[in-house]
């Protein structure tokens, strides 16, 4: 394989490394209150935390990036914590004919990795 | 649609926002010199730069993240610049039976976005 095994234990201490965290947001926060009806409050899972060397590497590219960041930190950024997958959610919104239920596939993160 | 159109012009000035940049790396840099034979030097495209509000948003989640980062910067990180696609590369490496050519699909970035 082109890379070492990604590391899953956080060397920085509990809760410091890339993980999923729930953030509550209202439709007003999102600027959606004019077209989304319900729910007015969303539980949004987001990816937060640091990506130390080889922690939850998304792929070979991320492993390389981590290594080159160690060698050239000014030139190559460290990997960062982004969604690896999403959980679909349903929103109710206004339509010309009334109210509709619609699925959004890329709104709430389900898992995170370092890319 | 659940989000405003992602912005493609960089408000921070030329070269400051998320873009593809080529980094030269040797097999020694990557720690691969013991098993990869050729090429000895790789042109690695990587994603670098900042992700100001709505710049090259990967999806709805990234748009939300940008907005919530503006409201709660201590709790929600800004989107960051990661690969949106990859270019396959071929490496020649040692095997038990000699030498083999192998394609790696996730080694070199081809495009970038803010996730």
């Amino acid at each position: 394989s082109a890379h070492a095994h990604p590391r899953d234990s956080c060397p920085l201490g509990p809760g410091r490394c890339c993980h999923l965290e729930t953030v509550q947001a209202t439709l007003e926060d999102l600027g959606w209150s004019d077209w989304v009806l319900s729910p007015r409050q969303l539980q949004l899972s987001m990816c937060v935390g640091e990506c130390p060397h080889l922690y939850r590497s998304a792929n070979t590219h991320a492993q390389i990036k981590a290594r080159l960041h160690g060698l050239q930190p000014d030139k190559v950024p460290a990997p960062c914590c982004v969604p690896s997958s999403y959980t679909p959610v349903v929103l109710m919104h206004r339509t010309d004919s009334g109210v509709s239920l619609q699925t959004y596939d890329d709104l709430v993160a389900r898992g995170c990795h370092c890319a | 649609s659940a989000h405003a159109h992602p912005r493609d012009s960089c408000p921070l000035g030329p070269g400051r926002c998320c873009h593809l940049e080529t980094v030269q790396a040797t097999l020694e840099d990557l720690g691969w010199s013991d098993w990869v034979l050729s090429p000895r030097q790789l042109q690695l495209s990587m994603c670098v730069g900042e992700c100001p509000h709505l710049y090259r948003s990967a999806n709805t989640h990234a748009q939300i993240k940008a907005r919530l980062h503006g409201l709660q910067p201590d709790k929600v990180p800004a989107p960051c610049c990661v690969p949106s696609s990859y270019t396959p590369v071929v490496l020649m490496h040692r095997t038990d039976s000699g030498v083999s050519l192998q394609t790696y699909d996730d080694l070199v970035a081809r495009g970038c976005h803010c996730a």
Partner: antibody, heavy 119, light 107 residues
């Protein structure tokens, strides 16, 4: 805890109207919509409609269109369902239920209100 | 409207049995399916949402699976308190619709 408390049982004559209330507590009333679902004796569940507690937008089942009106009073966190021109086949237990939420869940139900239509 | 067809309409089982109830949608509903348990004289109780997510406080012997048009509720080891009627419900689009129900009875 989150709960929906409905008004008491009603007995009505054919042609009359009934108004059932549903008082919400334990959550922000305007963050969700309220569904009304009914169940005739010995039968399954029938969705009657939905109202957005924040805006008052509604979506009614086709077969009840024109006879049903759903409203909310945000000052008291109460939803109402009025059904007019009652018939004997409207005899049922009427439930209010919160949702759908972001995962299409209708998660909290009222205890039900028995409405009997009889001459 | 999306029709929800549940089967069987009733099932006789013993404590400890594994019970499987199926629900079929007349058109694709992604994973927007919920399962409810209802006991006589009581309101329905949410067991499973989004086809496979267990509602908080519901025992892990209940599980849901499926997506698109075919869905399953499984009770891995039937307990005395599980004898009830079970309903599936779609919330992919209005009007929200329910299956006809499956009564789980004591054998």
């Amino acid at each position: 805890q989150v709960q929906l408390v409905q008004s008491g049982a009603e007995v009505k004559k054919p042609g009359a109207s009934v108004k059932v209330s549903c008082k919400a507590s334990g959550y922000t009333f305007t963050s969700y919509g309220i569904n009304w679902v009914r169940q005739a004796p010995g039968q399954g569940l029938e969705w009657m409609g939905w109202i957005d507690a924040y805006s008052g937008s509604t979506n009614y089942a086709q077969k009840l269109q024109g006879r049903v009106t759903m409203t909310t009073d945000t000052s008291t966190s109460t939803a109402y369902m009025e059904l007019r021109s009652l018939r004997s086949d409207d005899t049922a237990v009427y439930y209010c239920a919160r949702g759908p939420g972001q995962y299409a869940d209708v998660d909290v139900w009222g205890q039900g209100t028995m409405v009997t239509v009889s001459s | 409207d999306i029709q929800m067809t549940q089967s069987p309409s009733s099932v006789s089982a013993s404590v400890g049995d594994r019970v499987t109830i199926t629900c079929r949608a007349s058109q694709g509903i992604s994973s927007w399916l919920a399962w409810y348990q209802q006991k006589p004289g009581k309101a329905p109780k949410l067991l499973i949402y989004a086809a496979s997510s267990l509602q908080s406080g519901v025992p892990s012997r209940f599980s849901g699976s499926g997506s698109g048009t075919d869905f399953t509720l499984t009770i891995s080891s039937l307990q005395p308190e599980d004898f009830a009627t079970y309903y599936c419900q779609q919330a992919n689009s209005f009007p929200i619709t329910f299956g006809g129900g499956t009564k789980v009875e004591i054998k």
